[in-house]
């Protein structure tokens, strides 16, 4: 061994200086008699070594590194040997920090595993091997006087928790507990906890269950849930308080908390919930009034609240068959009266014959928003209800009366955009109570069953914007009927488009007669198409061989046109443009040649 390094300290605070000396023995005869000692930290050469020959002939180099900023590095003492650097000796240097005081020490008593589990936060990284030890002792009082020491609890590497087994615990008696952290640069201790393991007991939660419905018990009200829980038996004798949390399964609602509940409640009716809604519920408990820790939340229980009877207003409208006036088509729309108006399962139309107390004849039961039935001859009125499993809405009477009220006037319609139509009118005198507006495809696609309708509750309204089921390029029939106290007025109707289509093609041009300076053209007009506006005019265009263009505007009833002032023996390109308010379309181009001056006219 030719060289040997010694250091002031192999482990230092990060950033602190470190001094090292390297001694080369004299008997390394193969070396240069005056060798130059070099220092290297990691891969970098370090300047600043002070070299001297000692009295015994050995060479010594001393270096001071002002700041050791590597948490781990090798310091080497080297010589130049030929072209390479020869390492004579090296030492490992480490730098870091003494352990910070462990903080947030807390413990939980687990009655099932019969152990006290303590955990802590170790603090910032020390960059050095640091050991943690959970230390404790038994104490009769408030930990001022130390009783028997308990065996140290050493966590597995890298863990910040440790379990003290039951054999080292005394329940209902205080223990002093702290964490000691130790590394090469120092030792630190957490503040001491003084606790009775039972005061940090963490229980298991009860198991939530749905209550078995008993025949004599009343079913839960709408928006209520009946549930019960099975206490965790090993904690049965511990007085506890519990809390329940619940939230609807759908949507983004946060948990709502209910409590405190005594563990012994065992069964509970939870109200104030949304009807007909699936809820997730959980329960947790804590030792109380004595100290303890909250249990985890129990596994979820999923329950559905009962629904409430529909709370809706039913707007109704009806129509009689022209061929059979006793066959009635009844339409309705549910209008919620509350934010949560209850689910609607179906609708029933019924009639109560006069003089037959209690006898109600159902005329139809449907999930649709209309039904057709035969009205008994003596029936002037039927009742409509919406229903679900919880009951029915308030009955809506529907009275079948003649049209005896005044009619509205000046019914008109205009397009707002391709998907809406505005229908306006002048209200009759006296004001109606409201209006029914119906709309659907006009002829030839008209159908009574496919009409959309709306009730306008304001009798002073002078118009209504139709936004449902309106498509461009379709002709709509709009029917408006005023409604009065016990009757209605006659229905008025109007036709309208929300958007019309330009002509799809212009008629083909045909040459009928031609001369030297004229040409007679004709065409067959396109038949009118529904959804397309009527033609407003034609424009005929012709262009000569010199690319000069000419045009003439013709009215929409034109069937032909004579071009005059043409050049003899000349080529012309001609096309027809058919125009409506919605746009214009060109025909195909007709090319012709006028006759030569010596030729005879063609007819």
């Amino acid at each position: 061994e030719c060289g040997h390094i010694s250091v002031s300290a192999p482990i230092v605070h990060l950033g602190d200086p470190i001094t090292a000396s390297c001694i080369i023995k004299q008997n390394c005869s193969h070396l240069d008699p005056e060798p130059q000692i070099l220092w290297r930290l990691g891969a970098e050469l370090q300047p600043g070594g002070r070299q001297q020959r000692l009295s015994d002939g050995t060479q010594e180099s001393i270096i001071t590194l002002p700041h050791l900023n590597h948490t781990q590095a090798f310091l080497s003492c080297c010589l130049n040997w030929g072209n390479s650097l020869q390492i004579l000796d090296q030492v490992e240097l480490r730098a870091g920090y003494p352990p910070a005081i462990p903080h947030n020490l807390s413990c939980l008593m687990n009655l099932t595993t019969s152990s006290l589990i303590c955990q802590w936060e170790p603090g910032p990284e020390t960059h050095l091997p640091t050991s943690f030890t959970l230390k404790s002792f038994k104490s009769r009082g408030n930990c001022q006087t130390q009783g028997d020491s308990i065996l140290d609890c050493v966590p597995k590497d890298g863990q910040s928790h440790c379990c003290i087994p039951r054999k080292h615990l005394l329940l209902y008696q205080n223990m002093g507990i702290w964490v000691q952290a130790e590394n090469a640069l120092g030792t630190s201790m957490s503040p001491q906890l003084c606790l009775d393991p039972m005061d940090v007991v963490k229980l298991e939660p009860p198991m939530l269950r749905t209550m078995d419905p008993s025949p004599e018990a009343a079913p839960p009200q709408a928006g209520c849930l009946q549930l019960c829980w099975e206490p965790w038996q090993p904690g049965l004798h511990i007085n506890q308080k519990c809390e329940l949390r619940h939230k609807p399964q759908r949507g983004e609602a946060s948990w709502a908390l209910v409590g405190p509940l005594p563990l012994e409640a065992l069964q509970y009716e939870l109200c104030g919930l949304l009807p007909a809604t699936a809820y997730t519920l959980q329960i947790r408990c804590i030792r109380w009034p004595l100290p303890g820790h909250w249990s985890d939340w129990s596994p979820s229980l999923e329950l559905r609240t009962t629904e409430r009877a529909p709370t809706v207003r039913l707007d109704t409208w009806w129509r009689q068959r022209q061929l059979d006036p006793r066959t009635v088509q009844l339409f309705w729309k549910p209008v919620p009266l509350e934010e949560d108006s209850g689910r609607i399962q179906g609708y029933v139309v019924s009639w109560r014959p006069s003089g037959q107390a209690g006898a109600i004849l159902p005329l139809c039961n449907t999930t649709e928003l209309s039904c057709t039935f035969h009205l008994p001859s003596e029936a002037q009125e039927v009742a409509l209800v919406a229903y679900n499993s919880a009951g029915t809405s308030r009955p809506t009477p529907v009275v079948f009366s003649e049209s005896r009220g005044p009619a509205l006037t000046r019914l008109h319609a205009m397009a707002r955009d391709p998907h809406s139509l505005w229908v306006g009118w002048e209200p009759p005198n006296p004001w109606p109570q409201g209006y029914v507006i119906e709309w659907g495809l006009g002829p030839p696609s008209a159908s009574n069953s496919n009409k959309t309708w709306r009730m306008e509750q304001n009798g002073r309204a002078t118009g209504f914007l139709l936004k449902e089921n309106i498509r461009p390029f379709q002709l709509y029939e709009i029917i408006v009927t005023p409604l009065y106290q016990d009757t209605m007025g006659p229905s008025q109707h109007v036709y309208a488009y929300s958007q019309e289509m330009a002509p799809s093609h212009a008629p083909e041009l045909h040459l009928k007669h031609i001369g030297k300076t004229w040409a007679q053209l004709e065409w067959v007009p396109e038949p009118p198409e529904l959804g397309k506006s009527p033609l407003t005019h034609y424009t005929i265009f012709w262009t000569n061989a010199q690319n000069q263009s000419f045009s003439a505007i013709l009215n929409a009833s034109s069937r032909g046109f004579v071009l005059h002032g043409l050049e003899p023996a000349s080529l012309y390109h001609i096309h027809l443009m058919a125009a409506s308010q919605a746009g214009a379309t060109n025909s195909t181009v007709l090319t012709l040649m006028t006759l030569t001056p010596e030729g005879s006219e063609l007819h």
């Epitope: 039951r166 329940l171 090993p234 049965l236 004798h237």
Partner: antibody, heavy 118, light 107 residues
Framework: EVQLLESGGGLVQPGGSLRLSCAAS????????MGWVRQAPGKGLEWVSS????????PYADSVKGRFTISRDNSKNTLYLQMNSLRAEDTAVYYC???????????WGQGTLVTVSS | DIQMTQSPSSLSASVGDRVTITCRAS??????LNWYQQKPGKAPKLLIY???NLQNGVPSRFSGSGSGTDFTLTISSLQPEDFATYYC?????????FGGGTKVEIK
């Protein structure tokens, strides 16, 4: 000092009824589970029933279920055991006991003898 | 229901002897095992709770150990006042049950 004093024992015919009482003092009665344990002559101990601190939970041994009813009156610091349809095998010393949080019987009364015989 | 089996049912020992009584549960009961001492004509008295915790006022010669299904009550040096019947009791699950008892007699 905790004291539990049973009363109400005695001789009763099979099929008859008896009500045992246990007067408690020296601790906050309403915070503790209470229970009854019996011991037939020359035999071991048998748990009969317990009752939670506010009376909401009342487990029973299978041998007495449906016949015995445990109850308590926290305002009177008193525990009760109503025994109906008594049988000869119910003959025993009945002890009233205060329970601890881990289900141990912390304190016991001196016991009251119930004899079921014709 | 959990069955508690105590052994031996009786034993004879002398003052100063070390005495061990065992109790076995038919299924795991963690540490929910309590030991009682009963002298003739008297009410039982709690000695050990939760398997190994000495009840206040009980001499330290009494100790308990075990967990799960097998438990032991040890009297390190038997004293004249220790001659009595000893019972174990599980309190983890309802119904709570006692062992059949072990009678410790003077040899």
């Amino acid at each position: 000092e905790v004291q539990l004093l049973e009363s109400g024992g005695g001789l009763v015919q099979p099929g008859g009824s008896l009500r045992l009482s246990c007067a408690a003092s020296g601790f906050t009665f309403s915070l503790y589970w209470m229970g009854w344990v019996r011991q037939a002559p020359g035999k071991g101990l048998e748990w009969v029933s317990s009752i939670s601190s506010s009376g909401g939970v009342t487990p029973y041994a299978d041998s007495v279920k449906g016949r015995f009813t445990i109850s308590r009156d926290n305002s009177k610091n008193t525990l009760y055991l109503q025994m109906n349809s008594l049988r000869a095998e119910d003959t025993a010393v009945y002890y009233c006991a205060k329970l601890g949080e881990l289900g141990m019987f912390l304190e016991w009364g001196q016991g009251t003898l119930v004899t079921v015989s014709s | 229901d959990i069955q508690m089996t105590q052994s031996p049912s009786s034993l004879s020992a002398s003052v100063g002897d070390r005495v061990t009584i065992t109790c076995r549960a038919s299924q795991g009961i963690s540490s929910y095992l309590n030991w009682y001492q009963q002298k003739p004509g008297k009410a039982p008295k709690l000695l050990i709770y939760y398997a190994s915790n000495l009840q206040n006022g009980v001499p330290s010669r009494f100790s308990g150990s075990g967990s799960g299904t097998d438990f032991t009550l040890t009297i390190s040096s038997l004293q004249p006042e220790d001659f009595a019947t000893y019972y174990c009791q599980q309190s983890m699950w309802m119904p709570m049950g006692f062992g059949g008892g072990t009678k410790v007699e003077i040899k």
